[in-house]
């Protein structure tokens, strides 16, 4: 048995008459055989729902459902109501009815086995009939909507007549209807004004009634007719078996150069036409099982389920429905030697389901896991400035298709021919798996022996020893100029074009910094900055090189704080920046401020 | 009110250690980088050591480079300077001083009353 | 390293008089100067920021000016407070060295 509401709304006037009924309340069953008996719990509660008073006013029917006063609530009985309401005026009270044989402890009320009464009090006598506008003779000011359990016995669920009304002014003639298209499930009685349902409802058909009550009242020679909606909810049980849409139970996957855990292999899609089991007990509910085959592939492959609510299309209307996702999940890194095919089962299970048929499904991945061979081209030529600062990023190695590598983990290494000439260091991108070279020692690039750099680049796949092999070329260019003495570690410092342009600092190609102008359009990612090379730094991600030292590029490293407009990167640096930012890296900080239309020194000169 | 008590100082021989310590209050601490200021008898200031905020960074003067080491203790409220291998030339009053940055660099806005420092035989 | 170069190094002056004294970078520190005064057996005192901000409570006869490698420091009517060293600073690049300081003397 089950409530088809959790809340209902009277009102209650001070000392309206001891028998007066005040409403109907309805219970719906999920079995034909069910016989509904409605018991009242023992106390009125307040607000906040603070315990009042013993419930010694308000009684029920047991068989019917029929609330009604027992006897009147006088000005005393409210005033003493009143005083427990932790201060607060008292102007709602509320019981809860309990479905027998629901064995509900007082303190809880959830539907579907109990519903809360509510009633509005008047501190006033029920109003004279004729003073009753049309609104208050046909429905509660509250709007009630209804649940119904599909698949269930059809019953009664409302009554329409407001009962306090009826007794007290019984020469006004209250008459209703249900405005509904044709062929719906639901009646109105004319005589007892009961509104039932006509057969048993399926949610998978329409979810949702928004119908319209219709009540036309007579006094005297006066006709008025009230309109409210009246929507029903039809409340969804597990009545639908899984499906492939469109018949596809079979996924075929490569695995080749993706070969990180956690990577996504391949996906099938499975559609259920339900939305139970809700989403806290889903997983749990609904089971996926990689079946045994391959100890590798247990091993290998893992199976995640990501649900989904969907809507479909349903006798020209949406239903919710849910969609999962198996998920051929990478288990671990694949090694680039690994070779095998094979096909995997997964057994889908909605174990809420109770038929007909069978809520299993049996998912196919058809794996191919390829190896990978390393290979770099055979030479490398590259330049290098005299006047490069150590950190300057001076150029890339990747083995082939490197870009597209995860899980891969290639390390680059330099073998110098020349001893005393070792200018170049190599680290490895974990982004693309690709290696950057940069100037590691720049008293070797000063040294005029040292014009050119030979240097064997060797890439090797940490997990097989695997290796590959080229030719790096470094052809040193320039003359060396000493660099400005007293100019700042970092080029971030510098805050105006001129004073960048002027100075060196840590990362930068040409022993110069190098001055990026912003587009000036509020807090921008292109905001103005000095920098030692506007290719790597600020580009929103602090790379692998400039993250050997703070001073090389704080604007997409720094993790301290930015003060001025700004929006911080993620994890770090500063994402976006109003006017121009510039940083102290030694202490973890960064300004953005508005560019300076005016040097100080101008200011002087000008006076 | 924004208060730097420095304490440690003392009288030590040439090749000694010695760690001064600095007890702030009225400010945020962790927010804020910290210096190590040094002034000899009848000199002029010297800028020592310097600490960021989180601790994670610090750097030094050249003239005691490898010798000093600046640390903080963040929940403790305390800033460090601990010295070995003292000289005669290390003889000063050394002061903490709390950094305080604008776009055009650090500025010492509060400073500790300072601590002698003696380095002789 | 950058050198700071302050002067005069000494200076005598009667109070209510207008007092300039002047620093000078080795190369261009652009706007990255700070001024400071300390009185004897006491810690230095912020007095300039940025070449030209004044530190909140300083008095406003306090004022710096300059850009790039001069700068000066003007008391624009001298208390007797104000007989003590003046200290400049640059913060554009470590060392952030210190000027040697200019006595202010009553005449």
């Known amino acids: 048995l089950y409530f088809s509401r959790d809340a209902y709304w009277e009102k209650l006037y001070v000392d309206q008459a001891a028998g007066t009924p005040l409403l109907y309340v309805h219970a719906l069953r999920d079995a034909p055989e069910e016989v509904p008996s409605f018991r009242l719990g023992q106390h009125l509660y307040g607000t906040y729902r603070t315990r009042l008073h013993e419930n010694n006013w308000i009684c029920i029917q047991e068989d019917t459902g029929l609330l009604y006063l027992n006897r009147s609530l006088d000005h005393s009985s409210w005033e003493k109501l009143s005083v427990r309401n932790r201060g607060f005026p008292l102007l709602t009270v509320y019981l809860k009815v309990f479905l027998s044989p629901t064995s509900l402890r007082e303190g809880e009320c959830q539907w579907p086995g109990c519903a809360r009464v509510y009633f509005s009090f008047f501190n006033t006598s029920f109003p004279a009939c004729s003073s009753l506008k049309p609104r208050e003779l046909c429905f509660p000011e509250t709007r009630p909507s209804f649940r119904i359990r599909e698949n269930r016995p059809p019953g009664t669920f409302h009554q329409f007549r407001l009962l306090p009304v009826q007794f007290l002014c019984p020469n006004i003639s209250v008459a209703y209807r249900l405005l509904e298209g044709e062929g719906l499930p639901f009646r109105c009685a004319p005589d007892s004004l009961e509104v039932s349902t006509r057969w048993a409802l399926d949610r998978e058909q329409r979810e949702k009634y928004e119908l319209v009550a219709v009540c036309t009242v007579h006094a005297g020679a006066r006709e008025e007719v009230v309109m409210v909606p009246f929507p029903v909810t039809v409340y969804d049980e597990d009545d639908s078996a899984p499906t492939f849409p469109a018949g596809v139970d079979t996924a075929s996957a490569v695995v080749e150069f993706k070969r990180k855990e956690d990577t996504v292999v391949a996906t099938l899609r499975v559609f259920d036409a339900d939305v139970v089991p809700a989403s806290g007990e889903l997983v749990r509910r609904y089971t996926s099982t990689l079946l045994p085959g391959d100890t590798w592939a247990q091993q290998t492959f893992r199976v995640e389920h990501w649900p989904n609510e969907t809507s479909v299309q349903a006798n020209g209307s949406f239903v919710r429905a849910t969609v999962h996702d198996y998920r051929l999940v990478l288990n671990r890194n694949l090694s680039i030697s690994e070779n095998r095919t094979m096909q995997l089962a997964v057994l889908v299970n909605d174990s809420d389901f109770q038929g007909p048929g069978a809520g299993v499904l049996l998912l196919h991945f058809n794996v191919s896991v390829l190896p990978v061979s390393l290979h770099l081209p055979s030479t490398y030529s590259l330049s290098v400035s005299r006047r490069a600062r150590r950190f300057a990023q001076i150029g890339k190695v990747c083995v082939e298709n490197c870009q597209a590598f995860s899980g891969i983990n290639v390390q680059y290494k330099l073998h110098s021919s020349g001893a005393n000439c070792s200018t170049l260091g190599v680290v490895t991108s974990a982004e693309d798996t690709s290696g950057i070279l940069f100037v590691n020692d720049t008293k070797a690039l000063r040294r005029p022996k040292c014009a050119e750099l030979h240097y064997m680049v060797v890439a090797t796949d940490q997990q097989t020893s695997r290796q590959a092999q080229a030719q790096l070329l470094v052809t040193v260019e320039g003359s060396y100029v000493a660099e400005e003495a007293g100019c700042p570690l970092s080029c971030a410092v510098s805050k105006r074009r001129l004073e960048c342009e002027e100075c060196g600092g840590l990362g930068s190609p040409t022993g110069r910094c190098e001055w990026r102008q912003g587009d000036g359009k509020g807090i921008t990612r292109n905001f103005s900055t000095c920098s030692p090379s506007t290719k790597t730094c600020p580009d929103g991600h602090c790379d692998v090189v400039e993250t050997q030292d703070i001073n090389i590029c704080p604007q997409d490293c720094l993790r301290g704080s930015i003060v001025g407009g700004h929006e911080p990167g993620e994890p770090r640096g500063i994402k976006a920046g109003y006017g121009t930012c510039n940083c102290f890296p030694e202490e973890e900080k960064c300004f953005c401020e508005p560019e300076d239309i005016q040097d100080p020194l101008c200011d002087e000169l000008c006076r | 009110e924004v208060q730097l008590v420095e304490s440690g100082g003392g009288l030590v021989q040439p090749g000694g250690s010695l760690r001064l310590s600095c007890s702030v209050s009225?400010?945020?601490?962790?927010?804020?980088?910290m210096r190590w200021v040094r002034q000899a008898p009848g000199k002029g200031l010297e800028w020592v050591s310097g600490i960021s905020g989180s601790g994670g960074i610090t750097y030094y003067a050249d003239s005691v480079r490898g010798r000093v080491t600046i640390s903080r203790d963040n929940s403790k409220n305390t800033l460090d300077l601990q010295m070995t291998n003292l000289r005669a030339e290390d003889t000063a009053v050394y002061y903490c001083a709390k950094a305080e940055y604008s776009s055009s660099g650090a500025y010492f806005d509060y400073w500790g009353q300072g601590t002698l420092v003696t380095v002789s035989s | 390293d950058i050198q700071m170069t302050q002067s005069p190094s000494s200076l005598s002056a009667s109070v209510g008089d207008r007092v300039t004294i002047t620093c000078r970078a080795s190369q261009s520190i652009h706007n990255y100067l700070n001024w400071y005064l300390q009185r004897p057996g006491k810690a230095p005192k912020l007095l300039v920021y940025?070449?030209?901000s004044l530190q909140s409570g300083v008095p406003s006869r306090f004022s710096g000016r300059g850009s790039g490698t001069d700068f000066t420091l003007t008391i624009s009517s001298l208390q007797p407070e104000d007989f003590a060293t003046y200290y400049c600073?640059?913060?554009?690049?470590?060392?952030?060295?210190f000027g040697q300081g200019t006595k202010l003397e009553i005449k």
């Open positions: 940025a070449a030209s």
């Open positions: 009225g400010f945020i601490f962790k927010n804020y980088a």
């Open positions: 600073q640059q913060s554009y690049s470590a060392p952030y060295s």
